[in-house]
């Protein structure tokens, strides 16, 4: 004997987040009389998605005009799909009863999978700056994607990195997933202009991966090298002492001149020159009046860079010798003058 069958022809349906899902259902008979209902999940905890007979379901529309007496198409459309809508949907025929309709037959179910794009990867570096030759860790996070399969790659200046660890959570089934990856990068003195890139590829991105970047300029600290030199000037009783501060990054730098251990002058790097690799050079000088000194003077250039402990370089100024015969005649890279006469 013929009996109504509830046919859900699609075992699974895959829909992109934000789109509309069509869940197909056919009843093969108008008998018995009674409504169709759609549920997500099975058993006592199932969630009512649509009731042909009554209720308000703003996201659901019927594909056919279900008011037609002969209608056997009970397919529905669910709008604005989100990952939370994933699950197995059942089309269930009820037999008209009193006082309540009685469940008569269920379809085999259609599994709705939601394709959700990963969020833009966010790359974060260490909280404190590090110096060249040190290894620093970068993290990359992206959330809200589905299905779970995802590919993450790290690059430094276009070169793929291999030292990283990646986790996708949760491990089990979920409506959406997150990825977390930590990469280790060894800094070099040339990394001020370098970039670390986290690249995420997912089926929803149609071959156009998402990228998150971090500039190593926010991570690296390149300590300066100091050179103190003495040069004669035209006036025979004067000597120009320069402190060359080279190849430092970031720019935050304070220089102090000490005469025999006593603070002579403190200044902050302002008019710096930038090197091709992104580091900076700066020069400070003192104009020393030698005739005012009976004894040799120990001049010290002390630099505090980016809040780090000070580094210094000293130069002994011999007052007995003729100024023109002392020191070296090194060309300055920066002529932004800072002068001080010592009398």
């Amino acid at each position: 004997e013929e009996e109504l069958q509830v046919i859900q022809p699609d075992k699974s349906v895959l829909v992109a987040a934000g789109e509309t899902a069509t869940l197909r259902c056919t009843a093969t008979s108008l008998i018995p009389v009674g409504p169709i209902q759609w549920f997500r999940g099975a058993g006592p905890g199932r969630e009512l998605i649509y009731n042909q007979k009554e209720g308000h379901f703003p996201r659901v529309t019927t594909v056919s005009e279900s008011t037609k007496r002969k209608n056997m198409d009970f397919s529905i459309r669910i709008g604005n799909i989100t990952p939370a809508d994933a699950g197995t949907y059942y089309c269930v025929k009820f037999r008209k009863g009193s006082p309540d309709d009685v469940e008569f037959k269920s379809g085999a179910g259609t599994e709705l999978s939601v394709r959700a794009k990963p969020s833009a990867p966010v790359v974060s570096g260490p909280a404190a700056r590090a110096t060249p030759q040190h290894t620093v860790s970068f993290t990359c996070e992206s959330h809200g994607f589905s299905p779970r399969d995802i590919t993450l790659k790290w690059f430094k200046n276009g070169n793929e990195l291999s030292d990283f660890q990646t986790n996708v959570d949760p491990v089990g089934e979920s409506v959406s997933y997150s990825i977390h990856s930590t990469a280790k990068v060894v800094l070099t003195r040339e990394d001020v202009h370098s970039q670390v890139i986290c690249e995420v590829a997912h089926v929803t991105l149609q071959g156009d991966p998402l990228r998150g970047t971090a500039n190593l300029s926010e991570t690296i600290r390149v300590p300066p090298t100091l050179e103190v030199t003495q040069q004669p000037v035209r006036a025979e009783n004067q000597v120009n002492v320069t402190c060359q501060v080279r190849k430092f990054y970031p720019q935050r730098l304070q220089l102090t001149w000490l005469e025999n251990g006593n603070v002579s002058r403190t200044e902050t790097a302002s008019t710096v020159t930038e090197n091709k690799d992104g580091t900076y050079n700066w020069m400070s000088w003192l104009l020393v009046n030698v005739s005012a000194h009976r004894d040799d003077v120990k001049l010290t250039c002390q630099v505090e860079h980016d809040g780090q402990p000070a580094v210094s370089k000293s130069h002994d100024l011999k007052v007995s010798a003729h100024p023109k015969e002392q020191g070296s005649n090194t060309a300055a890279e920066n002529t932004g003058s800072n002068e001080r006469n010592i009398y």
């Epitope: 056919t26 093969t28 008979s29 108008l30 008998i31 009389v33 056919s64 037609k68 002969k70 397919s75």
Partner: antibody, heavy 119, light 107 residues
Framework: QVQLQESGPGLVKPSQTLSLTCTVS??????????WAWIRQHPGKGLEWIGY???????YYNPSLKSRVTISVDTSKNQFSLKLSSVTAADTAVYYC???????????WGQGTTVTVSS | DIQMTQSPSSLSASVGDRVTITCQAS??????LNWYQQKPGKAPKLLIY???NLATGVPSRFSGSGSGTDFTFTISSLQPEDIATYYC?????????FGGGTKVEIK
């Protein structure tokens, strides 16, 4: 009022695919919630329901023909079509298109087109 | 599939006679039954829907009754233009199925 007109070749070779189109005039194929059906009648015999389509694309085919039948709709042309593959002499018949109207009956029919399967 | 058994397969009656055709379904189809008239060389025409409702423009001499498995189609006063073959069709269960037809002739 709504009228239907079948069109397509009257002669099809065995093993080939029979293709017929039904053009709807006097109304829109996608309004009113009607189903659009194909029925055939073998020479001197009764009527056999082939299947129907709803403008949304929902179809149901007679299981006796299901593996060989495709019914499709083109709402922009106000047409629906029948394709029957791997035909044999047993598929020689008059093919009708019809509207399954509000009252569940097939209330509008085309005049029918005779299709002969022969080499 | 639901089997629709129509009887008689043919009949001959005089103009003005009352003609009755029966249709039996292989199982309960409620009142989901239609009756069609097909004249030679023409497409079928819907006469009765939902077992007993007259389709638009159909003369009142045609009528239908029945529910469940047994249905009757009646022409209260046969007219010459009623010479045709009559078919019942169920739409309770997919696929829709037709009866074998009853050919009505004038004596």
């Amino acid at each position: 009022q709504v009228q239907l007109q079948e069109s397509g070749p009257g002669l099809v070779k065995p093993s080939q695919t029979l293709s017929l189109t039904c053009t709807v005039s006097g109304g829109s194929i996608s309004s009113g919630g009607d189903y659009w059906a194909w029925i055939r009648q073998h020479p001197g015999k009764g009527l056999e329901w082939i299947g129907y389509i709803y403008p949304s694309g929902f179809t149901y085919y007679n299981p006796s023909l299901k593996s060989r039948v495709t019914i499709s709709v083109d709402t922009s042309k106000n047409q629906f079509s029948l394709k029957l593959s791997s035909v044999t002499a047993a598929d020689t018949a008059v093919y009708y298109c019809a509207r399954e109207g509000y009252h569940s009956g097939m209330d509008v029919w085309g005049q029918g087109t005779t299709v002969t399967v022969s080499s | 599939d639901i089997q629709m058994t129509q009887s008689p397969s043919s009949l001959s009656a005089s103009v003005g006679d009352r003609v009755t055709i029966t249709c039996q379904a292989s199982q309960d189809i409620s009142n989901y039954l239609n009756w069609y008239q097909q004249k030679p060389g023409k497409a079928p025409k819907l006469l009765i829907y939902d077992a007993s409702n007259l389709a638009t423009g159909v003369p009142s001499r045609f009528s239908g009754s029945g529910s469940g498995t047994d249905f009757t189609f009646t022409i209260s006063s046969l007219q010459p233009e009623d010479i045709a073959t009559y078919y019942c069709q169920q739409f309770a269960y997919l696929p829709w199925t037709f009866g074998g037809g009853t050919k009505v002739e004038i004596k």
